[in-house]
C-alpha cells in the first residue's frame, strides 16, 4: 500500500484546503525534473531558470555559462545544442509543432570562438530536423523531406537526396505511421559513432491512401489537411535504408542496405537502426504481420564500397504466443567485442528478461530471470550493465535500477536503488554520462519527485539536483488524496490497481467510483508515480473515489497477461474492469448506484464498450478521442494485435469489435462523447461513426467537438474539456455544484 | 569430410507425388541453409527450393510454388523435397546442395538423383 | 527475377589458352556472383564466390572479376581437366529466387 503522508491533524485541518480544479488546470502542482545534457564522462549543460546556458564539471565543481540568456533572446531561441567539439551552438526557434514528435524551426549557429552568429551559407528554413555529428562539427539537416550535409556550418550545403516531396518521398525523417507507431522519433537519419557515415531511411507513401479532414481556422473556406495514414489493412509504407560516407560524400553517393531475406518475401517493416562501430550497423526488420523479427548486423566492406550482411549475423526474433517484443521490439545494447550485443525478450517462461547474444539467438545466455520483467538497459560498460526493472517487493508498477557486475564470474546483482528513499521514491529512471562515469536518477514517485547524482563506480549521491522544493511546501496546506496499490486475484489473474480516497475517507460510508482507464496492449496505468491532476481533485474536493485497473493485456507482468488480448482487442481488458468493479463494490464502501467509466484514446474505446456491456454496473461515462472500429485506426498500431482485417484471417473479429455494433446498449446510460476535429492519429472519423449509430439507434447522449484540435485536446481546450467533465460526472453522481 | 546423399528418385507418372531425400554428414546440419537445385537434360541448372537452418523459413521458384514442400529434420541429418502434382517439365537431376553460411551461394553438391515424370 | 546471360555458350580453346567468360546481370547483384564448373556425369563444383574470391582447392589460374552487372570468370592457361561447362550465379542480398546463367562450355579446340 502507498500511502501518501498524511498532514492532516485536528487542530490543523482548519488551515488545509481541498484542491481546486483551478489548481489542476494552472498546473498548480506540477512538478520537476532535472535531466542532465552530458557531453563528457564528468560535465553536462543545463539550461539555468533564468534561461543560460550552463557547463558543470563534477570533477572540479566548477561551471560557466557557455551562452548567455542574452544571445538565446536574440533569436528567441527555445532550444539549443552545442557541437561535439565545442565550437559551435544551433539555436532552435520558431518552433512548430507538427505531430506527436515531429516539428519544424529556423536554426540559427552561433560561433562560440568569436561570439557571433555564422553568417553565409545560412541554413534554409524551416527545418525538419537537424543534428550535429557525434564527433567534430559536420551537420545533418533535413529541408523539404530532402537531407543535406554541412561539413562546417558555414559551408555549402551537400544534397544527398533529391527526391523528396511532401507527403510522398520522405528522407531523413518518418512518415506519419512510422513517426507515431514504429520509430517514436521526428528523425529517421543515424550517424555513425565517429562520424563517418550517415545512415538515412527514406520512405515511400506513394501508394498510402490518404485520410483528409477540415481545419477550420479563421478564413471564408477550411482547408483540407491530408496525411498518408494506411489503416488497418490498407497498402502501407515502403522503406529503403540508405547509408552515405561523410567524408566522400560524393564519391560513391548513398549505399542501399539490403533487407533480409525473410523479411523482404513479404510486406514489412523496418523497425530501428544502431550503430556499434564506424564500419558496423545494426538494422532490425520486422514482418507486416508482427510476429518475427530479424536483427541483421552489416559490415563494411571497403573493397566493395558497399554493406554486405552476411546471414550468420542475422537474428531471428519470433513470438508464438503474441506479437514480437512488447510495445516495440527491444533494441539490442552491444558489448565492446561489438559483435555480441544484450537484449530483452521473453523467457521460456514468458517473462521479458535481458539475454546475452554471443552467436546465435538459441544458444542466448539469460542474464535476468523471475517472475518480474526487466524493462530498460540503460548502460553497458566493460564491467558493468545498468538495467531497471520491476522485481522489488514484488510490485510491477515500481521501477528501480539495478547494476550487474558483468567483469566478473559469476556475475552479482545489486539494486542501486531500491533502499535510497523507500518510502519517497519507488519509480525512477538514470541518465547515464559517457563510460557511465556518473549518472543522475530521476525518481518520479509515489513522493514528491527528486532527481539526484551519482558516481558511477560507487553509486554514492553527489548531490541533489532537484527535489521540488516549492511543490513541497505548495502542498503542505493542501488535502491531498490518499493512494494505495493493490491487488486483486481473478481466475488466475492478477489484477493490480490503485485507489485514490478521499482524504477524510471512512470505510463505513458509501463514496461514488469513477473507474479512469486506457487497458491498452503493452500499457500500465498503475504506477508507483507522483501525481496531482484531475483525478486527484475529484477525490480530494468532490469526495469520488477513482480507481485504475490494470487488466489483460497490460505490460510487465509476463506473456501470459500481455498476449491475452491478441486478436481479441476489446474483449478481455473491458471485461477485467467489469470484474474489478463487481470486486470494488464488495468492498462496501462504494455506491453502487453513482459508477462512472472514462478514458481517452483507447482508454475511450474501452470505456464506451464498458458502458455498453449491458451490465448495468456503470451509471455514466466519458470517451475522450476514442477508437470506434479497428478498422479506423493505424495499420502499424492495429495489425500488431489484431492481424489483418481480412476474411481469411481476422476480420470477423474486426467487425465485433467495433463500439458501432453495441449502439443498442448505451440506452441505459449516460454517455459523454468527446473528439477534436483535427485529430490525426485517432481521426474524428471514429466518434462521427458512433454519434451516427447512436442516431440511428435513437439512443440520446451527450457530445462535445473540439473544433481544430488534435488528440492532445491542448491549451483552452483542456480546460474546457475537464470543466465540462466535471459538471458532467457531478450531474451523473447528483454533488452540488 | 561433407558429404550430401541425395536418393528417392525414380519414374513417375504426371499427377503423381514423390518425395527425395537428402542425408548430410561432416557438418552441423542444422546451422547451414540448404537448396535443391534441378538440371533437366541437356539443360543448365534451376535452383528449385531453399530451406534456412535457423527460423526455417522456406523458399520457392515460380514454376514448383504450390506443388513442392522443402523440409528438414536436423535430429536425423536430413532434408527433404516433397514433389506433388509432379509435370513432365520436372524431369531432372535434383541435386541436394549446402549454402554458405554467410550467402546463399553453394559450397558443396550431392551426386544427385533423377526424377523421370512421364505417361 | 535477376536474368544471367552467359557468353559465349560455347568456347572452343585448347590447352594452354586464356579462356574468358562472360556473365551479365539484368540488374545490379553487387558482388554477390558465383562460378561453378560442371563435368558430364558429375554434379557442379564451386570456383568462385563474392565475383572474386577463390574457393578451397581451387587452383589460381582461376580468377573472378566484376561487379555490378559485368562479371567474367577467367582461366589464365587451360589445362585438360578444365574443359567443361561452367554457370554463373547470383545471390544478390541472399534473396530467393537464387538464379543461374545458362552456362557456357569450353571444349578442346
Known amino acids: 500500500i502507498v500511502l501518501r503522508p498524511s498532514r492532516v491533524h485536528n487542530s490543523e485541518e482548519n488551515t488545509m484546503r481541498a484542491l481546486t480544479l483551478k489548481d489542476i488546470l494552472n498546473g498548480t502542482f506540477s512538478y520537476k525534473t532535472f535531466f542532465p545534457n552530458w557531453i563528457s564522462g564528468q560535465e553536462y549543460l543545463h539550461q539555468s531558470a533564468d534561461n543560460n546556458i550552463v557547463l558543470y564539471n563534477i570533477e572540479t565543481g566548477q561551471s560557466y555559462t557557455i551562452l548567455s540568456n542574452r544571445t538565446m533572446k536574440s533569436v528567441n531561441a527555445s532550444n539549443y545544442g552545442l557541437s561535439p567539439d565545442r565550437q559551435f551552438v544551433y539555436l532552435e526557434s520558431d518552433y512548430s509543432k507538427l505531430w506527436r514528435y515531429s516539428y519544424t524551426a529556423t536554426y540559427y549557429i552561433y560561433d562560440l570562438s568569436n561570439g557571433e552568429f555564422v553568417r553565409g551559407n545560412e541554413l534554409p528554413r524551416p527545418i525538419q530536423y537537424l543534428c550535429w555529428s557525434p564527433v567534430g562539427s559536420k551537420l545533418a539537416y533535413v529541408y523539404q523531406n530532402n537531407i543535406y550535409l554541412k561539413q562546417r556550418p558555414g559551408d555549402p550545403p551537400f544534397q544527398i537526396t533529391f527526391n523528396g516531396r511532401e507527403n510522398k518521398i520522405f528522407n531523413g525523417i518518418p512518415d506519419w505511421v512510422y513517426e507515431e507507431e514504429m520509430l517514436a522519433t521526428k528523425y529517421a537519419l543515424w550517424w555513425s559513432p565517429n562520424g563517418k557515415f550517415l545512415a538515412y531511411a527514406e520512405f515511400n507513401d506513394t501508394d498510402i491512401p490518404v485520410i483528409a479532414y477540415s481545419y477550420y481556422g479563421d478564413e471564408q473556406y477550411p482547408r483540407t489537411i491530408n496525411i498518408p495514414y494506411p489503416k488497418a489493412g490498407a497498402k502501407n509504407p515502403v522503406v529503403r535504408i540508405f547509408i552515405i560516407d561523410t567524408t566522400y560524400p560524393a564519391y560513391v553517393g548513398p549505399q542501399e542496405v539490403p533487407v533480409p531475406a525473410m523479411i523482404a518475401s513479404s510486406d514489412y517493416y523496418f523497425s530501428w537502426l544502431t550503430w556499434v562501430t564506424d564500419e558496423r550497423v545494426c538494422l532490425q526488420w520486422l514482418k507486416r504481420v508482427q510476429n518475427v523479427s530479424v536483427l541483421s548486423i552489416c559490415d563494411f566492406r571497403e573493397d566493395w564500397q558497399t554493406w554486405d550482411c552476411p546471414k550468420t549475423q542475422e537474428h531471428i526474433e519470433e513470438s508464438r504466443t503474441g506479437w514480437a517484443g512488447g510495445f516495440f521490439v527491444s533494441t539490442p545494447v552491444f558489448s565492446y567485442d561489438a559483435i555480441s550485443y544484450y537484449k530483452i525478450f521473453s523467457d521460456k517462461d514468458g517473462y521479458k528478461h535481458i539475454h546475452y547474444i554471443k552467436d546465435t539467438v538459441e544458444n542466448a545466455i539469460q542474464i535476468t530471470s523471475g517472475k518480474w520483467e526487466a524493462i530498460n538497459i540503460f548502460r553497458v560498460t566493460q564491467d558493468s550493465l545498468f538495467y531497471s526493472s520491476n522485481e522489488f517487493e514484488e510490485y510491477p508498477g515500481r521501477r528501480n535500477i539495478y547494476r550487474i557486475s558483468i567483469g566478473s564470474y559469476p556475475p552479482s546483482k545489486k539494486c542501486v536503488t531500491c533502499h535510497l528513499r523507500k518510502e519517497r521514491c519507488q519509480y525512477y529512471t538514470a541518465s547515464f554520462s559517457d563510460y557511465a562515469k556518473y549518472y543522475a536518477l530521476v525518481c518520479y514517485g509515489p513522493g514528491i519527485p527528486i532527481s539526484t547524482l551519482h558516481d558511477g563506480r560507487t553509486d554514492q549521491e553527489i548531490k541533489i539536483l532537484e527535489e521540488n522544493k516549492e511543490l513541497e511546501n505548495a502542498l503542505k496546506n493542501i488535502q491531498l488524496p490518499k493512494e494505495e496499490i493493490k491487488k486483486l486475484e481473478v481466475d488466475e489473474i492478477t489484477l493490480w490497481y490503485k485507489m485514490i480516497l478521499p482524504p477524510q475517507f471512512d470505510r463505513s460510508k458509501k463514496y461514488p467510483l469513477l473507474i479512469q482507464v486506457y487497458g491498452g496492449p503493452c500499457s500500465q496505468s498503475v504506477r508507483s508515480v507522483f501525481a496531482v491532476n484531475w483525478i486527484s481533485y475529484l477525490a480530494s474536493k468532490e469526495g469520488m473515489v477513482i480507481a485504475l485497473v490494470d487488466g489483460r493485456g497490460t505490460a510487465f507482468q509476463g506473456d501470459k497477461l500481455l498476449y491475452a488480448v491478441y486478436r481479441k482487442l476489446g474483449v478481455y481488458e473491458v471485461e477485467d474492469q467489469i470484474t474489478a468493479v463487481r470486486k470494488f463494490i464488495e468492498m462496501g464502501f462504494i455506491d453502487e448506484k453513482r459508477i462512472a467509466i472514462w478514458g481517452w484514446s483507447y482508454g475511450g474505446y474501452v470505456s464506451s464498450l464498458a458502458l455498453a456491456s449491458g451490465t448495468g454496473l456503470f451509471k455514466c461515462g466519458i470517451a475522450v478521442a476514442p477508437v470506434s472500429s479497428w478498422e479506423y485506426y493505424a495499420s502499424v498500431y492495429t495489425e500488431r494485435f489484431m492481424g489483418l482485417p481480412t476474411k481469411d484471417d481476422n476480420l470477423e473479429h474486426y467487425k465485433n469489435s467495433t463500439v458501432m455494433a453495441r449502439a443498442e446498449y448505451f440506452r441505459n446510460v449516460d454517455y459523454l462523447l468527446i473528439h477534436g476535429t483535427a485529430d490525426d492519429n485517432v481521426h474524428f472519423q471514429n466518434s462521427a461513426q458512433i454519434a451516427k449509430a447512436l442516431v440511428n439507434a435513437q439512443v440520446d447522449f451527450q457530445a462535445m467537438w473540439y473544433s481544430d484540435q488534435n488528440h492532445g485536446l491542448s491549451g483552452l481546450s483542456t480546460n474546457h474539456l475537464y470543466t465540462h467533465m466535471t459538471h458532467f460526472l457531478k450531474q451523473c453522481f447528483s454533488l452540488s455544484d | 569430410d561433407v558429404q550430401l546423399v541425395e536418393s528417392g528418385g525414380g519414374v513417375v507418372r504426371p499427377g503423381e507425388s514423390l518425395t527425395l531425400s537428402c542425408a548430410a554428414s561432416g557438418f552441423t546440419f542444422s546451422n547451414y541453409d540448404m537448396g535443391w537445385v534441378r538440371q533437366a537434360p541437356g539443360e543448365g541448372l534451376e535452383w528449385v527450393s531453399g530451406?534456412?537452418?535457423?527460423?526455417?523459413?522456406?523458399y520457392y521458384a515460380d514454376s514448383v510454388k504450390g506443388r513442392f514442400t522443402i523440409s528438414r529434420d536436423s535430429s536425423k541429418n536430413t532434408l527433404y523435397l516433397q514433389m506433388n502434382s509432379l509435370r513432365a517439365e520436372d524431369t531432372a537431376v535434383y541435386y541436394c546442395?549446402?549454402?554458405?553460411?554467410?550467402?546463399?551461394?553453394?559450397?558443396?553438391w550431392g551426386l544427385g538423383t533423377l526424377v523421370t515424370v512421364s505417361s | 527475377e535477376i536474368v544471367l546471360t552467359q557468353s559465349p555458350g560455347t568456347l572452343s580453346l585448347s590447352p594452354g589458352e586464356r579462356a574468358t567468360l562472360s556473365c551479365r546481370a539484368s540488374?545490379?547483384?553487387?558482388?554477390?556472383l558465383a562460378w561453378y564448373q560442371q563435368k558430364p556425369g558429375q554434379a557442379p563444383r564451386l570456383l568462385i564466390y563474392d565475383a572474386s574470391n577463390r574457393a578451397i582447392d581451387i587452383p589460381d589460374r582461376f580468377s573472378g572479376s566484376g561487379s555490378g552487372t559485368e562479371f567474367t570468370l577467367t582461366i589464365s592457361r587451360l589445362e585438360p581437366e578444365d574443359f567443361a561447362v561452367y554457370y554463373c550465379q547470383q545471390y544478390y542480398n541472399n534473396w530467393p529466387p537464387l538464379t543461374f546463367g545458362g552456362g557456357t562450355k569450353v571444349e578442346i579446340k
Open positions: 546442395a549446402k549454402e554458405n553460411n554467410r550467402h546463399s551461394f553453394f559450397e558443396y
Open positions: 540488374q545490379s547483384v553487387g558482388h554477390y
Open positions: 530451406i534456412r537452418g535457423r527460423g526455417g523459413s522456406t
